[in-house]
Amino acid sequence: IVLRPSRVHNSEENTMRALTLKDILNGTFSYKTFFPNWISGQEYLHQSADNNIVLYNIETGQSYTILSNRTMKSVNASNYGLSPDRQFVYLESDYSKLWRYSYTATYYIYDLSNGEFVRGNELPRPIQYLCWSPVGSKLAYVYQNNIYLKQRPGDPPFQITFNGRENKIFNGIPDWVYEEEMLATKYALWWSPNGKFLAYAEFNDTDIPVIAYSYYGDEQYPRTINIPYPKAGAKNPVVRIFIIDTTYPAYVGPQEVPVPAMIASSDYYFSWLTWVTDERVCLQWLKRVQNVSVLSICDFREDWQTWDCPKTQEHIEESRTGWAGGFFVSTPVFSYDAISYYKIFSDKDGYKHIHYIKDTVENAIQITSGKWEAINIFRVTQDSLFYSSNEFEEYPGRRNIYRISIGSYPPSKKCVTCHLRKERCQYYTASFSDYAKYYALVCYGPGIPISTLHDGRTDQEIKILEENKELENALKNIQLPKEEIKKLEVDEITLWYKMILPPQFDRSKKYPLLIQVYGGPCSQSVRSVFAVNWISYLASKEGMVIALVDGRGTAFQGDKLLYAVYRKLGVYEVEDQITAVRKFIEMGFIDEKRIAIWGWSYGGYVSSLALASGTGLFKCGIAVAPVSSWEYYASVYTERFMGLPTKDDNLEHYKNSTVMARAEYFRNVDYLLIHGTADDNVHFQNSAQIAKALVNAQVDFQAMWYSDQNHGLSGLSTNHLYTHMTHFLKQCFSLSD
C-alpha cells in the first residue's frame, strides 16, 4: 500500500484547506524536474531561472555562464543547442507547434568565440528541424521538406534533397502517421557518430487519402486543414532510407539503403535507425502486419560507395501471440565490439527482458529474467549495463534503475535506486553523461519529485539538483487525498488499481465513485507517481473516490495480459473496468447509485463502451475526444492491434467494436461527449458519428465541442473543459455547487 499522508491532525485541522479547482487550473501545485544537458563526461548545461545558459563542471565544482539572458532575449530565444566544438550555439525562437512532436522555428547562430551572431548565409525561416553534427559544427536542417547541409554555420548551404513537397514528399522529417505512431520524434535524420555520414528517411505520401477539417479562425471563411492520414486499411506512406557522405556530399550523392527481401515482399514500415560506427548502421523494419520485425545491420562498401546489408546480419523478431514489441519494437543498444547488442524482447515465458545478441536471435543470451519486465536500457559501458524495471517488491507501476556488471562473470546485479528514498521515490528515470561517468536520477513519486546527481562508478549521491521545496511548503496546509495501490485477483487475472480517497475517508461511509480510464494497449495508468490534478481535487474537495484500473491489454505485466486484447479491442478492457467496479462495490464504501466513468482518447472509447455495456452500474460518464470506430483511426496504430478491416481479416470485429453500434444502450445513462473540432489525431468525425447515432436512436445526451482545438484541448479550453466536467459530475452525484 502506498499511502500519501494527508497530514491532518485535529490541532491543525482549521488551518488546513481542501484543493480547489482553481488550484488545479492555475497549476499551483506543479512540480519541476532537472534533466542536465550533458556536454561531456563531467559537464552539463542548464538554463537558469533567469534564462542564462550556465555550464556546470562536476569535478571542478565550478560553473559559469556561456550565454547571457541578454543574448537570449535579443532574439526572443526559448531554446538553444551548443555545437560539439563548443564554438556556436543555435538559438531557437518563434516556436510554432504543428503536431505532437513537430514544430517550426526561426534559428539564429551565435558565435561564442567572437561574441556575435553569425552574419551572412543566415538560415531560412521557418525551419522544420535543425541539428548539429555529433562532432565539430556542421549543421543539417530541413526547410520546406528538403534537407540542407552546412559545413560551418557561416557557409552557404548544400541542398541534399530536391523533391520535398508539402503533404507529398517529406525528407528528414516524418509525415503525420510516422511522427505519431512509429518514430515518436519530429525528425527523420540521423548523423553517424563522428559526423561522416547523414542518414535520412524519405516519406512519399502521394497516394495517401487526406483528412480534411475546417479551421474556423477569425476570417470570413474557415480554412481547410488537409493532412495525408492513412486510416485503418488505407494506402500507407512509402518509405526509403538514404545515406550521404557529408564530407563530399556532391561526390556520389545520397545512397539508398536496401530493404530486407522478406520485408520488401509486401507493405512495410521503417521503424528506427541506429548508428553503430561511422561505417556501420542498423535499420529496423516492420511488416504492415506488425508481428514480424527485421533488424538489419549494414556496412559501408568503400569501393562501391554503397551500403551493403548481408542476410547474415538480419535478425528477425516475431510474435506468435500478438504484435512485435510492446508499444514500439525496442531498439538495440550496441556494445563496444560494434556488432553484438542488447535488446528487450519477450522471453519464453512471455515477459519482456534484456537479451544479448552476438550472432543470431535464436542464440541470444538472456540477461534479465523473472515475472516482471525490463523497461528501458539507458546505457551500456565497457563494464556496466544500466536499465529500468518494475521488479522491486513486485509492483508493476514502479520503476527502479539497475546496474548489471557485464565486465565480470557471472554478471552481478545491483538496484541503484530501490533504497534511496524508499517512501518518497519509487518511480525513476535517469540521464547519463558520456561513458556514464555521472548520472542524474529523476524521481517522479509517489512523494514530491526530486532530481539528484550521482557518481557513475560508486552510485554515490553528489548533490540535489531540484527538490521542489516551494511545492513542499505550499502543500503543507493542503488536505491532500490518500492514495493506495493494490491488486484484485479475478479469474486468474491480476487487476492492479490505484484508489484516491478523500482526506477524511471513513470506510463505514458511502462515497460516490469515479473511474478514470485510459486502457489502451501497452499503456499503464496505475503508477507510483506524484500528481496534484483534477482527480486529486475531486477527492479532496468534492469527497469522491477515484479509481484507476489496469486491465487486460495494459503493459509491463507480461504478454498474457498485454496480448489478451489482440484483434479484439473494446472487449476485455471494458470487461475489466466493470469487474473492478463490482469488486469496489463489495468493499462496502461505494454508493452504488453514484458511479461514473470518464476517459480521454482511448479512455473516451472505453468509457463510452462501459456506459453502453448495459450493466446498469454507471449513472453517468464522460468521453473526451474518443475513438468511436477503429476504421476512423490511424493505420499504424490500429492495425498493430486489430489487423486489417477486410472481410478475410478482421472486418467483423471492426464493425462490432464501434460505439455507434451500442447507441441504444446509452438511454439509461447520462453521457457527456466532448471533442475539439481541429483534432488532427482522433478526428472530430469520431464524435460526430456517435452524436449522429444517438440522435438517430433518439437518445438524449450532452455534448461540448471546442472550436479549433486539437486532441490536447489546451489553453483556455482546458479551464472550460474541467469546469464543465466538474459541473456535470457534481450534478450526476447530487453534490451541491
Epitope: 563542471n57 569535478e59 571542478t60 563548443r86
Partner: nanobody, 115 residues
Framework: QVQLQESGGGLVQAGGSLRLSCAVS????????MGWYRQAPGKQRDVVAG???????HYADSVKGRFTISRDNAKNTVYLQMNSLKAEDTAVYYC?????????WGQGTQVTVSS
C-alpha cells in the same frame, strides 16, 4: 578576477614546431575544460583545440594530427603543441575556457609561419 596569459608564440618556418602555454590564474582552474583559439588576419576567431576535464580532446579538421592540447593542473597551465606548421596556421592564438567566456580573453600570442 580571471587571468589567462598566453605565451610561446613566434616566427617559425613551415614544417617547424612551437609549444604554446597558457597560465591560468584567478577564480578558475585549468582543470576546467579549456580551449585554444586563433584569429588569422581579417578572419573571425575560431576554435583550434579543446580539452575536457575528463581528458577528451577535440581538434578542428585543419589541425588534426598536427596539434596536441594538454594540461598540467599542478602548474595550472594549458599547452598547445603545434607540429608540421603551415603558412595558414599564422594567427594570434588565445586560450580560454571551452566553451569560451567573453570577459576572459587575454592578449594572445602571435604565431607566424613563413614559407
Amino acid at each position: 578576477q580571471v587571468q589567462l596569459q598566453e605565451s610561446g608564440g613566434g616566427l617559425v618556418q613551415a614544417g617547424g614546431s612551437l609549444r604554446l602555454s597558457c597560465a591560468v590564474s584567478g577564480s578558475i582552474s585549468s582543470a576546467n575544460s579549456m580551449g585554444w583559439y586563433r584569429q588569422a588576419p581579417g578572419k573571425q576567431r575560431d576554435v583550434v583545440a579543446g580539452l575536457t576535464t575528463g581528458g577528451r580532446s577535440h581538434y578542428a579538421d585543419s589541425v588534426k594530427g598536427r596539434f596536441t592540447i594538454s594540461r598540467d593542473n599542478a602548474k595550472n597551465t594549458v599547452y598547445l603543441q603545434m607540429n608540421s606548421l603551415k603558412a595558414e596556421d599564422t594567427a594570434v592564438y588565445y586560450c580560454n575556457l571551452w566553451p569560451p567566456v567573453q570577459g576572459y580573453w587575454g592578449q594572445g600570442t602571435q604565431v607566424t609561419v613563413s614559407s
